[in-house]
């Protein structure tokens, strides 16, 4: 039985330069306990895009829209998109610990940037 699912419903998102990109992610359970973080890319070189607890992410805002009982919304919006923001973004659930350990990742959303 699945303990938890991380759902990124959009395989890809295309945004015009200068606009905002909404990256959707819903999670079906808070258990196991631990934070949700967003990354661009995969593997050891991935870039942290948003962490609720710590760090400064001036272009990122949270955009919870879901009122459904069966999942919780951990979507983000990234403002003032530029071509440098293109890439695949992953919503990742961590299990709380010392240190926190990655538990499950969403399938990823590929962000492409159109010219203005």
């Amino acid at each position: 039985e699945e303990e938890l699912q991380v759902i990124q419903p959009d395989k890809s998102v295309s945004v015009a330069a200068g606009e905002s990109a909404i990256l959707h992610c819903t999670v079906t359970s808070l258990i196991p306990v631990g934070p949700i973080q967003w990354f661009r890319g995969a593997g050891p070189a991935r870039e942290l895009i948003y962490n609720q607890k710590e760090g400064h992410f001036p272009r990122v805002t949270t955009v919870s829209e879901s009122t459904k009982r069966e999942n919780m919304d951990f979507s983000i919006s990234i403002s003032n998109i530029t071509p440098a923001d293109a890439g695949t973004y992953y919503c990742v659930k961590f299990r709380k610990g010392s240190p926190d350990t990655e538990f499950k990742s969403g399938a990823g959303t590929e962000l492409s940037v159109r010219a203005k």
């Epitope: 039985e1 303990e3 808070l30 949700i36 951990f74 979507s75 983000i76």
Partner: antibody
Framework: EVQLVESGGGLVKPGGSLRLSCAAS????????MSWVRQTPGKGLEWVAT????????YYPDSVKGRFTLSRDNAKNSLYLQMNSLRAEDTAVYYC???????????WGQGTTVTVSS | DIVLTQSPASLAVSLGERATISCRAS??????????MHWYQQKPGQPPKLLIY???NLESGVPDRFSGSGSRTDFTLTINPLQAEDVATYYC?????????FGGGTKVEIK
């Protein structure tokens, strides 16, 4: 119709043990996080223990950690709370509760009373 | 631990009037725009019953005279108009961080 039926409560001496059970029906038990919450007239509602849907992860507050053990049998739609080294302050009504998302408590049983007294 | 302080401890309201209950958390219970604050109703001799989940969402089957609002540390449960069957004790609960905690309860009576 969702039903959660607790059993196993009773009178026990300090230092003793009890095993509470919760029989679930009317929903897909194996998909739900399950918890115990207790209620006393003095302390109100207090979260006691939680177990993940597959049974891998368990969580306890400091007040019961090391003394209480939560387990589940998804094949039997049952939840169990083993309570050891019981203290007078563990006296309460114990409710079994389900949590679809591991967040809010969706459904509650009617409760079973545990009294710890010499 | 996140401490939840409910006020008032008891409340007497006339039938058909508005009842307002406050719950203040010692720290924010918000994450990614979700407010992990919930409200329950408990009548004598019965278990608690979920009314509102995640601050403002009405649980299925709950009358729409119940509503919830708030974010971060300050939350409100409103019953409008109050009916006789709403006499009960109401509790807030946070699931933002372990240990999960409850408010001390607000007893609602008819004036």
């Amino acid at each position: 119709e969702v039903q959660l039926v607790e059993s196993g409560g009773g009178l026990v001496k300090p230092g003793g043990s009890l095993r509470l059970s919760c029989a679930a029906s009317g929903f897909t038990f194996s998909s739900y996080v399950m918890s115990w919450v207790r209620q006393t007239p003095g302390k109100g509602l207090e979260w006691v223990a939680t177990i993940s849907s597959g049974g891998t992860y368990t969580y306890y507050p400091d007040s019961v950690k090391g003394r209480f053990t939560l387990s589940r049998d998804n094949a039997k739609n049952s939840l169990y709370l083993q309570m050891n080294s019981l203290r007078a302050e563990d006296t309460a009504v114990y409710y079994c509760a389900s949590q679809l998302t591991g967040s809010e408590f969706d459904y509650w049983g009617q409760g079973t009373t545990v009294t710890v007294s010499s | 631990d996140i401490v939840l302080t409910q006020s008032p401890a008891s409340l007497a309201v006339s039938l058909g009037e508005r009842a307002t209950i406050s719950c203040r958390a010692s720290e924010s219970v918000d994450s990614y725009g979700n407010s992990f604050m919930h409200w329950y109703q408990q009548k004598p001799g019965q278990p608690p019953k979920l009314l509102i989940y995640r601050a403002s969402n009405l649980e299925s089957g709950v009358p729409d005279r119940f509503s919830g609002s708030g974010s971060r540390t300050d939350f409100t449960l409103t019953i409008n108009p109050l009916q006789a069957e709403d006499v009960a004790t109401y509790y807030c609960h946070q699931s933002a961080d372990l240990p999960w905690t409850f408010g001390g309860g607000t007893k609602v009576e008819i004036k």
